[in-house]
Amino acid sequence: QKSSIEKCSVDIQQSRNKTTERPGLLNCPIYWQQLREKCLLFSHTVNPWNNSLADCSTKESSLLLIRDKDELIHTQNLIRDKAILFWIGLNFSLSEKNWKWINGSFLNSNDLEIRGDAKENSCISISQTSVYSEYCSTEIRWICQKELTPVRNKVYPDS
């Protein structure tokens, strides 16, 4: 039995997979901030988690996926106000009883130290200093991401 949040996440991911392949992104588009190999868009308005998920999708992006603690710290360094929370692309999967990223992978328990409960209708937000479990219906800001395409040097065989 999937929750409405999980269904929304799956639907959006499937619709993203159906879209035609786009050429790689070499530079961040207007209004997006580059952080290493990603482009980030920080909202200045608020939404519940699934509306935030949908908003990122309309921008041909996804809610932020964080690979490891190092990326978390670098992202948090871009958050200037201590009291502001941002949704990321991680929510509690009731069927698997685990934190699940919107790309389908599960949270490695060492990656993020989450404050709060792991339960139904819980979604993850980040602040300047912490990672929180919040009710997914809470209206807070959010962060979208686009992946930059790494520029690889072509290697030519010896002539």
Epitope: P29, I30, Y31, H44, T45, D55, K59, R80, I84
Partner: antibody, heavy 121, light 108 residues
Amino acid sequence: QVQLQESGPGLVKPSETLSLTCTVSGGSISYYYWSWIRQPPGKGLEWIGYIYFSGSTNYNPSLKSRVTMSVDTSKNQFSLKLTSVTAADTAVYYCARDGGIVGATEAFDIWGQGTMVTVSS
Amino acid sequence: EIVLTQSPGTLSLSPGERATLSCRASQSISGSYLAWYQQKPGQAPRLLIYGASSRATGIPDRFSGSGSGTDFTLTISRLEPEDFAVYYCQQYGSSPITFGQGTRLEIK
């Protein structure tokens, strides 16, 4: 509600630097983009560039070599410097809050009243 | 750079009539990130429409925007005396941000 107020000299000599400041009152400068736009007398609008609250900038290529923008979040102010001005830079200069592409406040939703800058010796 | 061409340059209509202003882009505008502004003499522009069709806060519902890709329209369903002004379209989906040259809406 948020209000913007431009300030700076109304007369600048050719080859000198035009400096303007925009003060934001009634709201935070954070997580918005802050644009400068100009309008020569009797003509249309030209975007000069924007600065994000974090300090990152995006300038119009036509002016990029002469433009510098800065932001002071502690004073809720952002500034424009335009070097080597000529008579062609004579215009009303506006600052505006730029909501970017995050819905509900997209585009330039709040403007200053504008300040006329004349370039003349 | 995306060039925006507005037509007509001047539109002469009477109060109560319907106004249709056009904005054509030289290339498709990403995400329909197109806005319309109204400017009266001696005043700063005022945001009317963003995202091609969303009305800004406090804008009367007689103003509506439509279109996607390269062709966009601002419609004023029933002109009020205060609507006579210059109207600009603006794209903000790619850098540099650009404006159309404006359409002057004058009283016939």
